[in-house]
Every structure is written in structure tokens, then in C-alpha cells.
Interface confidence: medium
């Protein structure tokens, strides 16, 4: 029977800068029941606080709700593991909410083949930002990537769309069925997961771009 091994805070993520969650990996339990607590303080303060919510994020997590989350303050946190033989502490983790935003995937992905009479046909892709993100405040800039491939192909073709929420693609293989997905990323944060795939059948008379 031993004191617990050193835990590690391995991930902190926020869906929208308004709340965030951190997760830790326990160390070895030393063969005894082990309790974990996450404590934190804000930059410039010495007063320590305990995690406000150990439930919402699932096992080995701490969730910071709206009233505990501030974009303008940085958090310094650690996890303490304790059993009957002693304690061990994780390394501290510095968290700036601006940097840990991982949005939900974009919504309402729509794909359409457009065949204007006077121009080359193209694939028109349109989507909406995730609902939790409020772009009107100006706090957020979302960047988008699109990926697509013929259904049976191994490699994805990736396009960067910048901040726009629609995109045109000209060079496609006629007669193929394509999968299309989109994802988004805030300026300082992480890429979202890819949206669910939308399928589009490219007509056989679709003319390849020169």
C-alpha cells in the first residue's frame, strides 16, 4: 500500500468561451481508495478555490459554469490525489479560456450542384456556425475548412474557406458520389470535429474545370 501516483490534467476545453471543462488522468491508486480534488486560483490572486462541479463533465473532470468562467482571467489549477498513505499533486496547468475553445461542428450543411448556362458548373456548399457561438458580439472569429472525396476514394481534398459560410468548388469528377464535411475553429482555439457527412451525386454531364 502506497500513496497515490501523480495525476495529470490532460485536457481543458470550452465550447464557447462561456463555460469550460478540464479532465485529469489519475495516477496509480496505491492499492487504496483515492480521492481527487481540483483546486485553482486566478492569475494575480493567491486565494485557492475548489472545483465548482465534479459531475457535469463526467468522471475525473471539473466543469466551470458561466458564473465561474471569465475570458479576461487566467486560471492556474492542479489536482490533488489523496489516500490513507499520503497525497500527490499534478503539475499545475495554466488555462486561458480564449485558447481552449473547441466549438461544436458547423450546422445545416447543404450541398448543391449548380449548372449556370453561361459558366462552368460548380459545387455550392453552405453551412451555419454552431449554435453555441455568438458571432455578433465580435468576441469570435470562426475559420472554416471543407473536406470532400468521392465515396470510394481514400484521400480527402481539403479547402480553406476562411470566415465565409459558403464555398464553391469547380473541379469534380462527373458521375461520382461525393462526401462533404465542414469544420470550424476560433482564431486561437481548436478545430471542431467534422460535421456529419452530406452526400451529393455529381451528374455525368458535369464538366471538369480546365
Amino acid at each position: 500500500q502506497l500513496p497515490p501516483g501523480k495525476p495529470e490534467i490532460f485536457k481543458c476545453r470550452s465550447p464557447n468561451k462561456e463555460t469550460f471543462t478540464c479532465w485529469w488522468r489519475p495516477g496509480t491508486d496505491g492499492g487504496l481508495p483515492t480521492n481527487y480534488s481540483l483546486t485553482y486560483h486566478r492569475e494575480g490572486e493567491t486565494l485557492m478555490h475548489e472545483c465548482p462541479d465534479y459531475i457535469t463533465g463526467g468522471p475525473n473532470s471539473c466543469h466551470f459554469g458561466k458564473q465561474y468562467t471569465s475570458m479576461w482571467r487566467t486560471y492556474i489549477m492542479m489536482v490533488n490525489a489523496t489516500n490513507q498513505m499520503g497525497s500527490s499533486f499534478s503539475d499545475e496547468l495554466y488555462v486561458d479560456v480564449t485558447y481552449i475553445v473547441q466549438p461544436d461542428p458547423p450546422l445545416e450543411l447543404a450541398v448543391e450542384v449548380k449548372q449556370p448556362e453561361d459558366r462552368k458548373p460548380y459545387l455550392w456548399i453552405k453551412w451555419s456556425p454552431p449554435t453555441l457561438i455568438d458571432l455578433k458580439t465580435g468576441w469570435f472569429t470562426l475559420l472554416y475548412e471543407i473536406r470532400l472525396k468521392p465515396e470510394k476514394a481514400a484521400e480527402w481534398e481539403i479547402h480553406f474557406a476562411g470566415q465565409q459560410t459558403e464555398f464553391k468548388i469547380l473541379s469534380l469528377h462527373p458521375g461520382q458520389k461525393y462526401l462533404v464535411q465542414v469544420r470550424c475553429k476560433p482564431d486561437h482555439g481548436y478545430w471542431s470535429a467534422w460535421s456529419p457527412a452530406t452526400f451529393i451525386q455529381i451528374p455525368s454531364d458535369f464538366t471538369m474545370n480546365d
Epitope: 481543458c12 499545475e92 488555462v95 482555439g189
Partner: antibody
Amino acid sequence: EVQLLESGGGLVQPGGTLRLSCAASGFTFSAYAMSWVRQAPGKGLEWVSSINVRAGDTYYADSVKGRFTISRDNSKNTLFLLMNSLRAEDTAAYYCAKARYSSNWGFDFWGQGTLVTVSS
Amino acid sequence: DIVMTQSPDSLTVSLGARTTINCQSSQTILHSSNNHNYLAWYQQKPGLPPKLLIYWSSTRESGVPDRFSGSGSGTDFTLTISSLQAEDVAIYYCQQYSNTPYTFGQGTKLEIN
């Protein structure tokens, strides 16, 4: 105003011992990690050792491991570096440095340094 | 150990000119847990201790003039002085604090012509 004042440097023979001290003021000493960084004459900076808020968490450069011991006395706002088995290559200005946080995340304040000369 | 390599070793620049110093780490110092690069930049003037300019690769320390900026991610970083002033003559060091041993670059000596 943050102040770090090193003392204890001087001339010592190879194999000798010195104990450096760093008196801290102007901030809550017990809330921050502290480090020693050295600079040989005309050379660059070399990290030597660090100690976190919890005094059990100490870290050393391979070049000094087993010979140097870092410690702190939070009640006296003082950082120490006990240097045993000194070698000529330990000759340097030794700076006491305050970390930005309670772990070792960049050094936001440095003392003026104390010179250690190891020579016969 | 993470090796930090700065370039150039020295440079001579005109007053008012834009100046860049590069720093490369031998392995990534970007932490996926918090999306931060564990990199600092220091300025050392003759006879004085180093002074922290930038931490987290791009956050300017309070009191540092806004002509100093840091950028980069992963393994490649840059310190930029947008308009060189006479008082910027110094040696500049990058440092990683991702893993012990914390390591510094060899330094870049900045002079004015």
C-alpha cells in the same frame, strides 16, 4: 516593488562548498516557484535548478545533479542553493529568478546576481 | 533535452528598422492540454540581469513596449521589434519551459549601425 538580492558568492577552491542565498521582498514569496540560473563570463544563460511552491518539488540540470541542493524558507522569504564538490566549470554569475506562477513558467524577475569563482 | 537554436547569432540593424530574431526548438513545446507554447523571450543589457519580454510565445510582459512582439507555434518562433530604438541594443534569449531541463537559446546579439 519586487526585489531579489543574492549573496554568498565568492572565490572557492575546486571541491569546495558554497551556500548562496536570495532574499526576496515585494511579493508573496510562498506563492511562487523560484529558480537559480547561471551565466559563465561572456557566455549565455544556463538554468541550474528550480523549486515549486511545495518544497518537495525540486528540479536540477544534469550538470549539477547530486552536487547542488535547492531549498527555500518561506517564513524568511529566502531561497538557497547549497553547492558542493565545486568545479572550475561552475564559475559563473548566479541569478535568483522568480517564476510567473507557482510552477516554473518563465522568470519574470531576476536578481542582480552573485559571482562564484572556482579556482585554485 | 530540448535544444533551442537561435538565428542569427548577431545582427546589426539601423534605427527604426523592423528586426526579427528566430528561435527553433528540437521538439514541440506546444501543449495540447491548454493550447499554449511554453516559450519565453528575454532581453539582457550589458552588466544587467535578463528581463522578461514575452511569455507563452506571444504574451507581452506588462511594461514591455508594444514594439516587441512574439509569434510562432510548435517548434518555430520569432521575436519581432517593429521599429528598433537605441535602447534595444542587447542580447536576446529564447527559453523553453515545457520540460526540465529548461533550456535557453545561445543568444542573439543586437547592435545598431
